[in-house]
């Protein structure tokens, strides 16, 4: 059992039917010696008197808000809630699996930049009765610090029958450096408390592999005169690490007919121009990537060719 | 990357050309490692991340754009040293921070080249003759230090008369590569960026 | 007394479709996991399929994805596997099973698929 | 589709110590508990050991569990004749999880 905050605890079971539980015992935080008595939750029915309370915990019946009182006093309480261990490995109840980048991701992190500023998401089917505390810090033995909001609801999908909920969080380094070379990782904790049932998910990365630039801006349409040539010009997003010219962007240039199934011309190009043929009734997009580390490309800029 | 990118002439700047070969071919050589060695940690989220140039370069500090010099995040460990003196320097107009920079660079190179020769060394005596480091690679290595053309002590190549221990020597190859390209990230920025200065 | 009885074997042609039962007792039977697994006469141990406490997520191992499907329903304390188009390497004797690190086996129903 | 690796079959005379090895991989056993079973002909498999190397109740302290790595091993220290049986382990994958990852199966005879 450990205390996730003032007056609430976690008790660590080993998850399977007929399972001993565990033994926890509760002491009431008050000077009083005598006459007190316990009671769980709304209930009246007194669990036991005295001081402490021992109690087996081996289901979800036995956990929640356990209150000593005094002659119709509240004194104290103490939340119980279970964490549950299925051989071997904790329970991930509470959030979906996003199966991307891989199976078992369930928190999903992007940066658009290189200043330390990052959003992690996540996602649930549980509407009520849900709190998230997010924690995180670069490298864990010698943590140093990174600051991050309240998580909050960020979506509402529909998903077949089901409703999906995502709920997202900022993070920011306290003192990053936009050039720094990384060696120890981004670590984000978070606490999920639904009911009363706690998990816990981490996620672990260097910002440079989450990189995921916004989408190009200004981009513009020239025709060149007596030509079914245009040329696309476009500039590096806001929100893009300056200078420039040091965290510079790679570019994909592509021409996508009405139907999805014409093919799709591309161009690669480091500048922040190029030359296509404008077909009718086709679009031109673009989407930026860091040029020089590999990581996730833009979401598509795009304007009609017409 | 697999597709065809038009990619910017060099122009006035040889060592820009040269950082990008740099940047393909160590991204090729990790990929291959990674591939070759798969049962082996040898990915980001497994290896220790170690910096063989950790308190004998500053490559990054010596670099900063001077953007980014306002920044106090970036300015923990500014060097001072003072090496002149390459063919990269664009005329007199280089600046102290600049010669500063690119020698950093060549050190890195330097200590890089000796790791990476000392290890394929020993990867030839390894009878799997499971993996090997890429002549590209190493060439190309040895082009950037020679368009950089600073004068600098030779270091000894490491000979070591035990009996390697092959895993362990796999386990640092990807130790070494995966640092090297993040390093190579670095020299390729710096370089874009003193071109367009 | 942690019970796990299962019903539902037998004999069947190859395409069709065969559906077993598993009735847990002497447990909260909502609060746990549950797998199936098989053996083929003469081999090894293959895991079949999981479904969550409350039924919200199922795994399938590839050799049945698409032909069966998991359930349970939790007011009748019941684990089920519905198996269609059954195969000649569908033979096995089929294991109703508790998630965790002390597990509970069914007795074992043997399900034959043969013309 | 076994990535759990068992030699097929061990054999060892009463008295004697007898192991079972299962090998793995890095994103299996390296990451995760391993179990053991042992299967009498006609019976449903029987938890030996659970979390690598602790013996549930009622299971005879001549079994022991051990691992290091990517590989487990399962040690009868004094076999006797009933314990002539399959043994399977049991792991789970980082990425297949909660699907049970068994072993080949190994088939221990007790001689004379």
């Known amino acids: 059992i450990w205390e996730l905050k003032k007056d609430v605890y976690v008790v660590e079971l080993d998850w399977y039917p007929d399972a001993p539980g565990e033994m926890v015992v509760l002491t009431c935080d008050t000077p009083e010696e005598d006459g007190i008595t316990w009671t769980l939750d709304q209930s009246s029915e007194v669990l036991g008197s005295g001081k402490t309370l021992t109690i087996q915990v081996k289901e979800f019946g036995d956990a929640g808000q356990y209150t000593c009182h005094k002659g119709g006093e509240v004194l104290s309480h103490s939340l119980l809630l279970l964490h549950k261990k299925e051989d071997g490995i904790w329970s991930t109840d509470i959030l979906k699996d996003q199966k991307e980048p891989k199976n078992k991701t369930f928190l999903r992190c992007e940066a658009k930049n290189y200043s330390g500023r990052f959003t992690c998401w996540w996602l649930t089917t549980i509407s009520t009765d849900l709190t998230f505390s997010v924690k995180s810090s670069r490298g864990s033995s010698d943590p140093q610090g990174v600051t991050c909001g309240a998580a909050t609801l960020s979506a509402e999908r529909v998903r077949g029958d089901n409703k999906e909920y995502e709920y997202s969080v900022e993070c920011q380094e306290d003192s990053a450096c936009p050039a720094a070379e990384e060696s120890l990782p981004i670590e984000v904790m978070v606490d999920a408390v639904h009911k009363l049932k706690y998990e816990n998910y981490t996620s672990s990365f260097f910002i440079r592999d989450i990189i995921k630039p916004d989408p190009p801006k200004n981009l513009q349409l020239k025709p060149l005169k007596n030509s079914r040539q245009v040329e696309v010009s476009w500039e590096y997003p806001d929100t893009w690490s300056t200078p420039h010219s040091y965290f510079s962007l790679t570019f994909c240039v592509q021409v996508q007919g009405k139907s999805k199934r014409e093919k799709k011309d591309r161009v690669f190009t480091d500048k922040t121009s190029a030359t296509v043929i404008c077909r009718k009734n086709a679009s031109i997009s673009v989407r930026a990537q860091d040029r020089y580390y590999s990581s996730s490309w833009s979401e598509w800029a795009s304007v009609p060719c017409s | 990357r697999n597709l065809p990118v038009a990619t910017p002439d060099p122009g006035m700047f040889p060592c820009l050309h040269h950082s990008q070969n740099l940047l393909r071919a160590v991204s090729n050589m990790l990929q291959k490692a990674r591939q070759t060695l798969e049962f082996y940690p040898c990915t980001s989220e497994e290896i220790d991340h170690e910096d063989i140039t950790k308190d004998k370069t500053s490559t990054v500090e010596a670099c900063l754009p001077l953007e980014l010099t306002k920044n106090e995040s970036c300015l923990n460990s500014r060097e001072t040293s003072f090496i002149t003196n390459g063919s990269c320097l664009a005329s007199r107009k280089t600046s102290f921070m600049m010669a500063l920079c690119l020698s950093s660079i060549y050190e890195d190179l330097k200590m890089y080249q000796v790791e990476f020769k000392t290890m394929n060394a020993k990867l030839l005596m390894d009878p799997k003759r499971q993996i090997f480091l890429d002549q590209n690679m190493l060439a190309v290595i040895d082009e950037l230090m020679q368009a950089l053309n600073f004068n600098s002590e030779t270091v000894p190549q490491k000979s070591s008369l035990e009996e390697p221990d092959f895993y362990k020597t796999k386990i640092k190859l990807c130790i070494l590569l995966h640092a090297f390209r993040i390093r190579a990230v670095t020299i390729d920025r710096v370089m874009s960026y003193l071109n367009a200065s | 007394q942690v019970q796990l009885v299962q019903s539902g074997g037998g004999v069947v042609q190859p395409g069709r479709s065969l559906r077993l039962s598993c009735a847990a007792s002497?447990?909260?039977?909502?609060?746990?996991?549950m797998h199936w697994v098989r053996q083929a006469p003469g081999k090894g141990l293959e895991w079949v399929a999981f479904?969550?406490?409350?039924?919200?997520?199922?795994y399938y191992a590839d050799s049945v994805k698409g032909r069966f499907t998991i359930s349970r329903d939790n007011s009748k304390n019941t684990l089920y596997l519905q198996m269609k188009s059954l195969r000649a390497e569908d033979t096995a004797v089929y294991y109703c099973k508790t998630h965790g690190s002390h597990d509970n086996w069914g007795q074992g129903t043997m399900v034959t698929v043969s013309s | 589709s076994y990535v759990l690796t068992q030699p097929p079959s061990v054999s060892g005379t009463p008295g004697q110590r007898v192991t079972i090895s299962c090998s793995g991989g890095r994103s299996n056993i390296g990451d995760n508990t391993v179990k053991w079973y042992q299967q009498l002909p006609g019976t449903a498999p029987k938890l030996l050991i659970y979390?690598?190397?602790q013996r549930p109740s009622g299971v005879p302290d001549r079994f022991s569990g051990s691992k290091s790595g990517t590989s487990a091993s399962l040690a009868i220290t004094g076999v006797q004749a009933e314990d002539e049986a399959d043994y399977y382990c049991q792991s789970y994958d980082r990425g297949t999880h909660p699907a049970l990852l068994f072993g080949t199966g190994t088939k221990v005879t007790v001689l004379g």
């Open positions: 479904i969550r406490y409350d039924g919200s997520n199922k």
């Open positions: 002497g447990f909260t039977f909502s609060s746990y996991g």
């Open positions: 979390g690598n190397d």
